[in-house]
């Protein structure tokens, strides 16, 4: 059972039956930090059912205490979480891993981004690395349009100051592994890739470590490529309308298009009693089209003022771009002014100017 991709890998499995007292891990965490203890199976073999124990008492999973067969995670650690932790085989109660955990008042925020990238003793309690802003590291998936720039950050602290390295899909990641290279800022705990391409897709892991432990975070990068398409018109627009003679009417058409769309409003007409030409193409008249000073927003609305019976009929919003055309149509019914207003159909709406 995985506890997510943010891992504090500090435990090591004992290679002998039951660890000697001197083999227990001495670990220091900052208050508010996430404590993660890892206990892989000895020799890499099957582990079987395990239990995690703190100060001799079995740990009960909760929202804050996440228990897995090989890993224990305690979120938002406090002084009360200090103590002796062990991972044991459930059946035999044999101790597989043992940890001594101390939670101190180490700072949990504030990136010293311009600090020296040297592992020096600051005089503060020595301790394993921890994320300086863990609440900022919840998001794991980054989807970016091709040709833009990506930055992954893993700001951390610890004493001695930890080092940071990067993996792509679990392997060491260096500048020569991608065209355009990468830019690293150890003081900002960051990796930058300029002008990303589809081959940059993958899992990127920062590994932050010092002699007291190691933490890691994995991000997934997706690079998006646009496939051009003809305009998309919002469903249900324009809508059928019923209006009273002399009132005003508006038809709306919402157009979505990558390429700049060309929008026209057409009214279907009859020629010699026929609605379509010999080739089946409808007869139409153009009511509104792009001009020097018309905006797309203006073109998405067709306004009819003081409607007459001649305005009744079928109206079409036609949108085209370099890929192709799309169109939606709607009907206008015009009622005499003295008649009761009735809806033309369930989709129509009534405008009484």
């Amino acid at each position: 059972e995985s506890l997510g991709t943010e891992q504090r890998v500090v435990g090591r499995a004992a290679e002998v039956p039951g660890p000697e007292p001197g083999q227990q891990e001495q670990l220091v965490f900052g208050s508010g930090d996430a404590v993660e203890l890892s206990c892989p199976p000895p020799g890499g073999g099957p582990m079987g059912p395990t239990v995690w124990v703190k100060d001799g008492t079995g740990l009960v999973p909760s929202e804050r205490v996440l228990v897995g067969p090989q890993r224990l995670q305690v979120l938002n650690a406090s002084h009360e979480d200090s103590g002796a932790y062990s991972c044991r085989q459930r059946l035999t109660q044999r101790v597989l891993c043992h940890f001594s955990v101390r939670v101190t008042d180490a700072p949990s925020s504030g990136d010293d981004e311009d600090g020296e990238d040297e592992a020096e003793d600051t005089g503060v309690d020595t301790g394993a690395p921890y994320w300086t802003r863990p609440e900022r590291m919840d998001k794991k998936l980054l989807a970016v349009p091709a040709a833009n720039t990506v930055r992954f950050r893993c700001p951390a602290a610890g004493n001695p100051t930890p080092s940071i390295s990067w993996l792509k899909n679990g392997r060491e990641f260096r500048g020569e592994h991608r065209i355009g290279g990468i830019k690293l800022r150890h003081q900002q705990w960051s990796l930058v890739m300029e002008s990303v391409v589809p081959s940059d897709r993958g899992n990127y892991t920062c590994v932050v470590e010092n002699k007291f432990g190691s933490i890691r975070q994995t991000y997934t990068l997706d690079v998006l490529e646009r496939s051009p398409h003809r305009p998309i018109l919002q469903a249900g627009l324009p809508a059928n309308q019923t209006a009273v003679l002399g009132s005003d009417v508006e038809f709306h058409c919402k157009v979505y298009s990558d390429a700049q769309p060309h929008i026209q409003w057409l009214k279907h007409v009859e020629v010699n009693g026929s609605k379509v030409g010999p080739d089946g193409t409808p007869y139409v008249t153009v009511l509104k089209t792009a001009g020097a000073n018309t905006t797309d927003k203006e073109l998405e609305v067709l306004s009819l003022h003081n409607v007459t019976f001649e305005d009744a009929g079928e109206y079409t919003c036609l949108a085209g771009n370099s890929i192709g055309f799309s169109h939606h149509s709607a009907w206008l019914v015009v009622l005499p002014a003295e008649e009761e207003l009735v809806e033309a159909d369930e989709a129509g709406s009534v405008y009484a100017g």
Partner: antibody
Amino acid sequence: EVQLVESGGGLVQPGGSLRLSCAASGFTFTSTGISWVRQAPGKGLEWVGRIYPTNGSTNYADSVKGRFTISADTSKNTAYLQMNSLRAEDTAVYYCARTYGIYDLYVDYTEYVMDYWGQGTLVTVSS
Amino acid sequence: DIQMTQSPSSLSASVGDRVTITCRASQDVDTSLAWYKQKPGKAPKLLIYSASFLYSGVPSRFSGSGSGTDFTLTISSLQPEDFATYYCQQSTGHPQTFGQGTKVEIK
């Protein structure tokens, strides 16, 4: 080679309209954005607005919101700045610039960087 | 809006000098800061992005540093072509805003 060429500038009366064009070449137009930046004579740079042709999303400076509209025609690799209700204070050299985003999960915004600029076109609003 | 204040507004220097320009934001902009160079009658050119990343093709004598509200552009050894006006610009907040510029003149 990335190139941006602005056109459409000129003299216009207050209250009038003008449409500037920015013809782009040498890069994938739909992946990055186009920003418009202006510079009044002898003054500093002022960001006007930005479009991302991929989804048509636009952003504007408050000083031009409601008067200026940015659009793009990806089939022509061209961006436009439609300027209506022009005022004397809109007099400036207008630059278009290719704009890319720096995407970073650690922060809740996208940093926008303008890396290639056109030569600029002068718009003079005067009666 | 986030105000960007550059200092000094102008400075005189000689070829070979080390020049430092500072930019202060009215609120925290993290590392979302770019530096541009502009010569009279020409379009601006990008030098630095994300506070400290040198844009490709820009000479290594240019460097940027800082985060939060205080930023610095340094030219380690001024060259004749570096006499120009330099602008900082933030894009963490909307709208993007520029500093008023720093003019670097020949002494």
